[in-house]
Amino acid sequence: MRRGPRSLRGRDAPAPTPCVPAECFDLLVRHCVACGLLRTPRPKPAGASSPAPRTALQPQESVGAGAGEAALPLPGLL
């Protein structure tokens, strides 16, 4: 489930960068793009063994603010 638009202001960012719900903020180009253009995280199927050296992303069990996906101030995340 994607989040709605969020204002994004980092300590290095000059201004807020809102993205509409279908868009994600691409840090490399520093603007909003369709989320489908970015490799957004996909859940790993249960019991699947991913081929080395693939390693999927997951938040740690205990996530501090700003460290895990749930705490990210980036818009349009899963």
Partner: antibody
Framework: VQLQESGPGLVKPSQTLSLTCTVS????????WNWIRQHPGKGLEYIGY???????YYNPSLKSRVTISRDTSKNQFSLKLSSVTAADTAVYYC????????????WGQGTLVTVSS | EIVLTQSPATLSLSPGERATLSCRAS??????????LNWFQQKPGQAPRLLIY???NRATGIPARFSGSGSGTDFTLTISSLEPEDFAVYYC?????????FGGGTKVEIK
């Protein structure tokens, strides 16, 4: 998702090194697709990327000699490094980062390219 | 470009011991409230393997003995109790801005 590098393992000095990375299980029209190299016994050096839109970025240290391109019909992206010398002997990896952390979680197994006459 | 300095270059430890690896950036790798600092493990003849992303988050399948901490310019990778398969080279990498850069690596070897 798998990445597989391919290309000649031996290149002569002053020639152009050409490598291809074939991606399966994901589309190169999504995300960033990178080349990284590692000189024997040394650390990792970032070469550059081609993005979902086809735009490219090259490490300034190699920019004058590097070209990264793609063939979306084959789901491949390629590296060309011109005017090679022995200092370009390295294992070349293709890799891709996930969003939103840009952490490279997809890697090819790497291919050793030796520059020698 | 952002320069990453890892220390020590080599760490000689025994299985079961705690390993503490350091990575220092020449400037902050924080942006938008995130530390864009990742850790990789590499064994001979293999591609690097992502261990930790965004400073403190374990990648899928990475054992709980691996943990990352830090923000800004100073980061630490800790292996709480070394297993035989943990002896390898570890690299930090920043993904805040291109060119993405790697530290010089820390080799964790058996004492």
């Amino acid at each position: 998702v798998q990445l597989q590098e391919s290309g000649p393992g031996l290149v002569k000095p002053s020639q152009t090194l050409s490598l291809t990375c074939t991606v399966s299980g994901d589309s190169i029209t999504s995300g960033y697709w990178n080349w990284i190299r590692q000189h024997p016994g040394k650390g990792l050096e970032y070469i550059g990327y081609i993005s979902y839109s086809g735009s490219t970025y090259y490490n300034p240290s190699l920019k004058s000699r590097v070209t990264i391109s793609r063939d979306t019909s084959k789901n491949q992206f390629s590296l060309k490094l011109s005017s090679v010398t022995a200092a370009d002997t390295a294992v070349y990896y293709c890799a891709s980062p996930n969003y939103p952390f840009y952490a490279m979680d997809y890697w090819g197994q790497g291919t050793l390219v030796t520059v020698s006459s | 470009e952002i320069v990453l300095t890892q220390s020590p270059a080599t760490l000689s430890l025994s299985p079961g011991e705690r390993a503490t690896l350091s990575c220092r950036a020449s400037e902050s790798v924080d942006n938008y409230g995130i530390s864009f600092l990742n850790w990789f493990q590499q064994k001979p003849g293999q591609a690097p393997r992502l261990l930790i992303y965004a400073a403190s988050n374990r990648a899928t399948g990475i054992p709980a003995r691996f943990s990352g901490s830090g923000s800004g310019t100073d980061f630490t990778l800790t292996i709480s109790s070394l297993e035989p398969e943990d002896f390898a080279v570890y690299y930090c990498q920043q993904s805040k801005e291109v060119p993405w850069t790697f530290g010089g690596g820390t080799k964790v070897e058996i004492k």
